[in-house]
Amino acid sequence: LIIGFGISGRHSITVTTVASAGNIGEDGILSCTFEPDIKLSDIVIQWLKEGVLGLVHEFKEGKDELSEQDEMFRGRTAVFADQVIVGNASLRLKNVQLTDAGTYKCYIITSKGKGNANLEYKTGAFSMPEVNVDYNASSETLRCEAPRWFPQPTVVWASQVDQGANFSEVSNTSFELNSENVTMKVVSVLYNVTINNTYSCMIENDIAKATGDIKVTESEIKRRSHLQLLNSKAS
């Protein structure tokens, strides 16, 4: 969490951003909140990116003002106009690209004063893993698949029964480049699994950590997946 304060002749206002991660090829949200104003027409929101000459986005007098917008963001940004009045300056970013990563500044002017806060935005790819029993294999085998990751993640297997065990000798992980030549499909196979046990396939890079669990008993198979972004720090 980053909290910034204004430093000009006017009073300062508190602006808060949250470091976040964007999944390439999808919508991203750059979070920013500020002390609200009672009049929409008095609020100015400017989003800037370090190293980019033009603005990322500008909203003033109740509407978007894009005359100074940098071309790399044209048609790709919008604020939540109906939420600006309650202090939400978050930015919606279309079709996140690797090149969108960097330091952004959320700069706010209201009748109460000015303020700004920086936001670190990481970009990559992350997806939920799915763990299944591989019935084609000669022995009891689990297969963990996740369709899109970047940068290349690490994959670690764990088991509820054999806590702390190292499964690297009985597992095999491969990374297959997807059609857009950036992200990769992750496939990891775990051999010699035992029944009545819960196994976890953990995939992690510097952006996200995802876990796929599978519980195999004689009568049923239960699955669960979880994904967590690693760098959600507020400023």
Partner: antibody, heavy 121, light 107 residues
Framework: EVQLVQSGAEVKKPGASVKVSCKAS????????IGWVRQAPGQGLEWIGD????????NYNEKFKGRATITADTSTSTAYLELSSLRSEDTAVYYC??????????????WGQGTLVTVSS | DIQMTQSPSSLSASVGDRVTITCKAS??????VAWYQQKPGKAPKLLIH???TLQPGVPSRFSGSGSGRDYTLTISSLQPEDFATYYC?????????FGQGTKVEIK
Amino acid sequence: EVQLVQSGAEVKKPGASVKVSCKASGYTFTSYWIGWVRQAPGQGLEWIGDIYPGGGYTNYNEKFKGRATITADTSTSTAYLELSSLRSEDTAVYYCARLDGSSYRGAMDSWGQGTLVTVSS
Amino acid sequence: DIQMTQSPSSLSASVGDRVTITCKASQGFNKYVAWYQQKPGKAPKLLIHYTSTLQPGVPSRFSGSGSGRDYTLTISSLQPEDFATYYCLQYGNLLYAFGQGTKVEIK
């Protein structure tokens, strides 16, 4: 309610130009992109290009670059498509459509009724 | 430019049938695929955007799915009013592109 009302049918000779209008109402005209799509008789939809009236920014299908010009008059909330050097294969229904997502270029969510342009000698 | 290859170009089905239409993008990955329904003499109607988000007022029998280069529109139980032509649209990039269309006819 979002409404896009297009100008009437046109008959043009090969080599001539046509200008189709699209008057918008029910939303803030300068805050949303407007796109143009055409459909030849019995054929599919073909994206021509779009404009952001709040800044006059445009994007064009490579096929129509140099022949299509998309403009917008913010005082009348009207978008225009002008197509020059017409040929018989330009005979089609031309649609305007608002892109959802405000300044974010989304999918086309509201459409005009279409304008039939016939090119015939 | 990204091209969208839609299949089949036409299909015959009966009321109550499950119908699946697919679109394959020529390159890249993004979720910016929309689906439209068009009836003769009418403007297209947006059914689904962002791969799977249903437009307000569109019946829940319509659903969208997909990832990577492959996207699907499914009508779970075809109704008489669903006989029409369906188009996919790729809108993630600077240049938009429609699929060629799929005509759903009565068997």
